[in-house]
């Protein structure tokens, strides 16, 4: 079998809502991944995992279940929704993304993304991580690749 | 408005220990982690930790591991720096300071800790 | 730990001139930097936050930038409250270090 080839694009847009009372953030990010299959033969994206981390923190995680098939050669556009939530100890961070005298208050995230595929019985997990400014501020929408994301050698320490 | 006030100076004798304290107030105490750091005359700065009064979660550098304990009575809004085993080097100014997303936003006045026999 | 590398050490200026100063961090820091004065004798004064964002009564003659692992400060028109001496920070992952300071001194 050739390689199934998973590359995630970035966000594509983040959602916000704050509680006041509760001090605490609301974040739906939208996230992109191409996956591309290599074979002559059709796969199975079975499901896609994902989770986001703040502060090496976890805030959010999702799960997408019997997603799609791509066939042979062919690749498709994925986007998934992951809800994320920032407060309690990190609740401090509310002072930030409300803070009315800055214009963008972006936010470092890490993005962590599985994808398992079938075919034939065999099953693949594939996963990627990055890092990703957000904007915690405001309602976004980004251009593909347009927040920047980087690879990650080494999580944090 | 936010402040962070320290104990005054300290003068003590090598071998000693100290206990400093770093009194918060306008604010909500528990929302923000409060750090700690050295500073030897006319030098930079170094961080020695930080505790999280929400969850009481404390961070220390390594090199400050055995020298430096920090602890908290939320009663008071108080946050303290305890040094042991005190040496010369020992001596410096150490500030309190609140963490804030990308930046230490206020800072105590500062303790002075001279270690003399 | 990440090192963070401050220059010039020191600086010797005319009030009225404009100043940069930069800070390396030895690995990328995603903007998890502040920039702090300190007069002789005082605490440390937050200018800028998350590399780019201004503190509360700051004037803004002050500005922050940059990314990755390269950062700076510039400050326009120097005014004679602005001599002392400045300080990096990186607030990525523990333990936060400082860069060496620049000690800015009237000319």
């Known amino acids: 079998p050739r390689s199934i080839d998973v590359k995630y694009i970035g966000v594509k847009s983040a959602y916000v809502s704050y509680d006041v009372q509760k001090r605490t953030i609301y974040l739906n990010i939208t996230n992109t991944l191409n996956i591309t299959n290599n074979n002559y033969y059709s796969v199975e994206v079975e499901n896609i995992t994902a989770q986001v981390q703040f502060a090496k923190t976890v805030i959010g995680k999702a799960r997408l279940n019997n997603i799609t098939h791509i066939g042979p050669l062919d690749m498709k556009q994925i986007d998934y929704t992951v809800p994320t939530v920032i407060a309690e100890e990190m609740s401090y961070m509310y002072d930030f993304c409300t803070l009315i005298s800055i214009k963008v208050h972006n936010i470092v995230l890490m993005m962590q993304v599985t994808v398992t595929t079938t075919y034939f019985g065999h099953s693949e997990q594939i996963s990627q991580e990055r890092y990703q400014y957000v904007d915690c501020g405001r309602n976004t929408t980004y251009q593909l690749g347009q927040s920047e994301y980087l690879n990650v050698l080494q999580p944090q320490q | 408005q936010v402040q962070l006030q320290q104990s005054g100076a300290e003068l003590v004798k090598p071998g000693a220990s100290v206990k400093m304290s770093c009194k918060a107030s306008?604010?909500?105490?528990?929302?923000?982690?409060i750090e700690w750091m050295k500073q030897n005359h006319g030098k930079s700065l170094e961080w020695i930790g930080n505790f999280h009064p929400y969850n009481d979660d404390t961070k220390y550098n390594e090199k400050f591991k055995g020298k430096a304990t920090l602890t908290v009575e939320k009663s008071s809004s108080t946050v303290y720096l305890e040094l042991s085993r005190l040496t010369s080097d020992d001596s410096a100014v150490y500030y309190c300071a609140r963490y804030f997303y990308g930046g230490m936003d206020y800072w105590g006045q500062g303790t002075s800790v001279t270690v003399s026999s | 730990d990440i090192q963070m590398t401050q220059s010039p050490a020191s600086l010797s200026v005319s009030v009225g001139e404009t100043v940069t100063i930069t800070c390396r961090a030895s690995?990328?820091?995603?903007?998890?930097l502040g920039w702090y004065h300190q007069k002789q004798g005082k605490s440390p004064q937050l200018l800028v936050f998350a590399a780019t964002n201004l503190a509360d009564g700051v004037p803004s003659r002050f500005s922050g930038s940059g990314s990755g692992t390269q950062y700076s400060l510039k400050i326009n028109s120097l005014q004679s409250e602005d001599f002392g001496t400045y300080y990096c920070q990186h607030l990525w992952s523990v333990p936060w270090t400082f860069g060496g300071g620049t000690k800015l001194e009237i000319k």
């Open positions: 306008g604010y909500t105490f528990t929302t923000f982690p």
């Open positions: 690995e990328n820091i995603y903007s998890s």
